[in-house]
């Protein structure tokens, strides 16, 4: 039998064993957060499919998440989420350590589908193992891109209290309008929740006495998030090398003081 | 409890060496970074130099850069500082300090007693 | 690097408030601690990251910090808190203010 003609994409294709890993992914993460136990995994994964499966990959749509974004509804304490752009890693190191802040992958959507590809096909029930669209060659539609979106920008819109931005201070865009963090989550944060917006620029290393928050991309973001009625604080990180200490060891009372 | 305390002061003529200790007590002396931060009679604080946790990174104040060498012992919970070619203005008290700090910040939570360095001829 | 300045003195009476600033360029950029010195005794840490306050160190002591301007508050001043006060932050290497002398009049 000859194998069905599949529509060849420049992206790599879904993840091996993407239903098991985000069945099981959804079940160790409602384990772990009693707030979350009401929530019926297969149910999860029956809206995360639906949203993707017999879909034209490159016609994927925000609404098509949502069935998937009501049953992951969640929110996070004003003052405690914490954004990111372009330096994940070390967010994710920090909010494993400070338990109380929360990046997007710190709840349910966002734990279930970090570092995950999927796609599916046209009119067929099958998932694309072999390729699936990348973003910037193929189509910015993709069920990968749409999902992250829809999740970042309902992550923005319950946002409350303070936020923090962690940005990557190492990079020529320390702030950059073309990010997800630029693009969509900026955008949708409500000013009569949110009091202000905190970045923190992270340096490369103790050696980099400089300024960063003075840097023009910082100043756009200022202006973008002044113009949004939302007070902008900025604080230039030194030490990097606290976070990946702390990380390693958690216990040491030298990491259990206030941010 | 927290215990720095300081040794190794005295008087010196000028272009000579001291070397300064401090002994550490009622923490994990190998989990953190330590500090030399000194205060000239009548005047402010001023840092001198510093140690991370392991001995691996040093770092200097312009002012003692090529003068002063900063150690450490974990084994014996001991931190040192090695001062060379020593002038007038190097006179002042020392402070032994350990570097805490969130993940955002550091600062000095616990400082000793400190030691009083002259450099006179 | 970064230059911290602080006012030499500062007079207060008997539980009024007093403020001690540390100015610097766009010092709001940085996290800044606060050190008490008493005559004869070592440096003790009351304020750090801006605005948070060491276990034991009393509730009238409080800090803020945006724009050029650093300050310390201590409301309903003791004669207690008569001493030196040191500003300090980091940018890659440690940097502290002149120090202010705060007398509790009376």
């Known amino acids: 039998v000859l194998p069905r003609w599949r529509q060849q994409w420049s992206g790599s294709g879904t993840t091996s064993r993407f239903p098991e890993t985000v069945l099981a992914r959804c079940v160790k993460y409602t384990e772990v957060h009693p707030e979350m136990r009401h929530v019926d995994c297969q149910s999860v994964w029956d809206a995360f499919k639906g949203a993707f499966i017999s879909k034209y990959p490159c016609n994927i749509t925000e609404e098509d998440y949502q069935p998937l974004v009501k049953l992951g509804t969640q929110t996070v304490p004003c003052n405690k989420t914490l954004l990111w752009s372009r330096i994940k890693d070390l967010a994710h190191q920090f909010t494993q350590v400070q338990r109380d802040m929360f990046t997007l992958e710190d709840m349910l959507l966002g734990y279930l589908a970090d570092d995950l590809t999927w796609c599916g096909e046209f009119n067929t029930f099958e998932i694309n193992y072999q390729s699936c669209p990348d973003w910037r060659k193929d189509c910015s539609n993709n069920p990968v891109s749409v999902f992250w979106k829809t999740v970042s920008r309902r992550f923005a819109e319950t946002a409350c209290g303070v936020v923090h931005v962690m940005l990557n201070g190492s990079r020529s865009k320390i702030f950059d309008k073309n990010s997800t963090f630029g693009s969509v989550e900026v955008h949708n944060l409500q000013p009569e929740k949110v009091q202000a917006l905190e970045a923190w620029v992270i340096h490369g290393g103790r050696e980099d006495s400089r300024d960063l928050c003075q840097d023009p991309t910082i100043k756009e973001l200022e202006s973008i998030i002044s113009k949004r009625n939302i007070r902008f604080f900025c604080k230039n990180i030194y030490r990097p090398d606290k976070f990946l200490q702390c990380v390693k060891n958690p216990e040491d009372s030298s990491c259990l003081s206030g941010i | 409890q927290v215990q720095l305390v300081e040794s190794g002061g005295g008087l010196v003529q000028p272009g000579g060496s001291l070397r300064l200790s401090c002994a550490a007590s009622g923490f994990t002396f190998s989990s953190y970074a330590m500090n030399w931060v000194r205060q000239a009679p009548g005047k402010g604080l001023e840092w001198v130099s510093g140690i991370s946790s392991w001995g691996s990174s040093t770092y200097y104040a312009d002012s003692v850069k090529g003068r002063f060498t900063i150690s450490r012992d974990n084994s014996k919970n001991t931190l040192y500082l090695q001062m060379n070619s020593l002038r007038a203005e190097d006179t002042a008290v020392y402070y032994c300090?350990?570097?805490?700090?969130?993940?955002?910040?550091?600062?000095?939570?616990?400082w000793g007693q400190g030691t009083l360095v002259t450099v006179s001829s | 690097d970064i230059e911290l300045t602080q006012p030499p003195s500062v007079s207060v009476a008997p539980g009024q408030t007093a403020r001690i600033s540390c100015s610097g360029d766009?010092?709001?950029?940085?996290?800044v601690s606060w050190y008490q010195q008493k005559p004869g005794q070592a440096p003790v840490l009351v304020i750090y990251s801006d605005s948070n306050r060491p276990s034991g160190i009393p509730e009238r002591f409080s800090g803020s910090n945006s724009g050029n301007t650093a300050t310390l508050t201590i409301s309903g001043t003791q004669a207690e808190d008569e001493a030196d006060y040191y500003c300090q932050s980091y940018n890659g290497t440690y940097v502290f203010g002149g120090g202010t002398k705060l007398t509790v009049l009376g």
């Open positions: 766009n010092i709001g950029h940085y996290y």
């Open positions: 300090a350990r570097e805490d700090g969130s993940y955002m910040t550091d600062y000095f939570a616990y």
